[in-house]
């Protein structure tokens, strides 16, 4: 769930998600609309798609709590628990490392970006 995601993003990126990513651009944080503003925003849009897919599979994406290990900068999603828990971990791991890969293009001006300015076509999943 959300607690897992926050912890994982902090471990991988070194940034506090609540201060750096939720919200950011047009897709990081709750909801999402329009064209992603940059590579970091694209990470979140892809993550939204990942969650949307799990929702169609009946997974409780905000409630399910999964186990994972973080060591030497890597995330190992546990094969414990239900299918949904395992897949949720995979979605969160992907976004965490995507955000890390794009730290060099992170733009402070996109933090708390005003969502009405998010125009254009929302990318399909």
């Amino acid at each position: 769930g959300i607690l897992n995601l926050n912890k994982m993003v902090k471990q991988v990126t070194g940034k506090m998600p609540i201060l750096s990513y939720w919200p950011y651009g047009c897709h990081c944080g709750l909801g999402g609309r329009g064209q992603p503003k940059d590579a970091t925003d694209w990470c979140c849009q892809t993550h939204d798609c990942c969650y949307d897919h799990l929702k169609t599979q009946g997974c409780s994406i905000y409630k399910d709590y999964y186990r994972y290990n973080f060591s030497q900068g890597n995330i190992h999603c546990s094969d414990k628990g239900s299918w949904c828990e395992q897949q949720l971990c995979a979605c969160d791991k992907e976004v965490a490392f995507c955000l890390k890969r794009n730290l060099d293009t992170y733009q402070k001006r996109l933090r708390f970006y005003w969502r009405p300015h998010c125009r254009g076509q929302t990318p399909g999943c």
Epitope: G58, W83, C84
Partner: antibody, heavy 121, light 106 residues
């Protein structure tokens, strides 16, 4: 060869605590990825999953019974335990311990013979 | 929790007859697992991840399905197939079983 065997009190009174032991051989609960579940089956009825314990002592419980269940293990003695508090006649059942398959960790490939527990009012 | 509804609850089949046992999930699941149980014995693993036969299961058995609808099929009923069959999911917690389908020999 993997084997599991359950043992229990046989008969106990309502409101007592049920203590079950699963003794196994052919694998070790210190092996990464390994785990054991408890599953019960009232006479003539279906199966109900109760709890699971992993090699690293991570535990999972059926939410409908969580407040009454405690699963634990003794890795060196190859045993897994289940305690059910405040039992009722509805807890009368055959209790199985089971181990998932390595090739499919959501399939219980190995089962004990079961131990019959009767709760009298 | 996901509720698995098996149908029929009881059925009988003649030797050589094709048999289909259904398992319907209250919400979509990724895989279904099946067990065979005979009176006085523990359940045996029968089918895993929807369509894979467990070790020692005769090839006349097959499994299929997706979403909320799954089934176990016996292409040609044999006397030794008389048993109760249970479906199981662990798509989401908690792990749940169906109530079982008792298959009798006609």
């Amino acid at each position: 060869q993997v084997t599991l065997k359950e043992s229990g009190p046989g008969i106990l009174q309502s409101s007592q605590t049920l203590s079950l032991t699963c003794s196994f051989s052919g694998f070790s609960l210190s092996t990464s990825g390994m785990g054991v579940s408890w599953i019960r089956q009232p006479s003539g009825k279906g199966l109900e999953w109760l709890a699971h314990i992993y090699w690293d002592d991570d535990k999972r419980y059926n939410p409908s019974l969580k407040s009454r269940l405690t699963i634990s293990k003794n890795t060196s003695r190859n045993q897994v335990f289940l305690k059910i508090t405040d039992v009722d006649t509805a807890d009368s059942a055959t209790y199985y311990c089971a181990r998932p398959a390595f090739y499919s960790n959501h399939l219980f490939a190995y089962w004990g013979q079961g131990t019959l527990v009767t709760v009298s009012a | 929790q996901i509720v698995l509804t098996q149908s029929p609850a009881i059925m009988s089949a003649s030797p050589g007859e094709k048999v289909t046992i259904s398992c319907s999930a209250s919400s979509s699941v990724s895989y279904m697992y099946w067990y065979q149980q005979k009176p006085g014995s523990s359940p045996k693993p029968w089918i895993y991840r929807t369509s894979n036969l467990a070790s020692g299961v005769p090839a006349r058995f097959s499994g299929s399905g997706s979403g909320t609808s799954y089934s176990l099929t016996i292409s040609s009923m044999e006397a030794e197939d008389a048993a109760t069959y249970y479906c199981q999911q662990y798509h989401s917690s908690p792990l749940t079983f169906g109530a079982g389908t008792k298959l009798e020999l006609k």
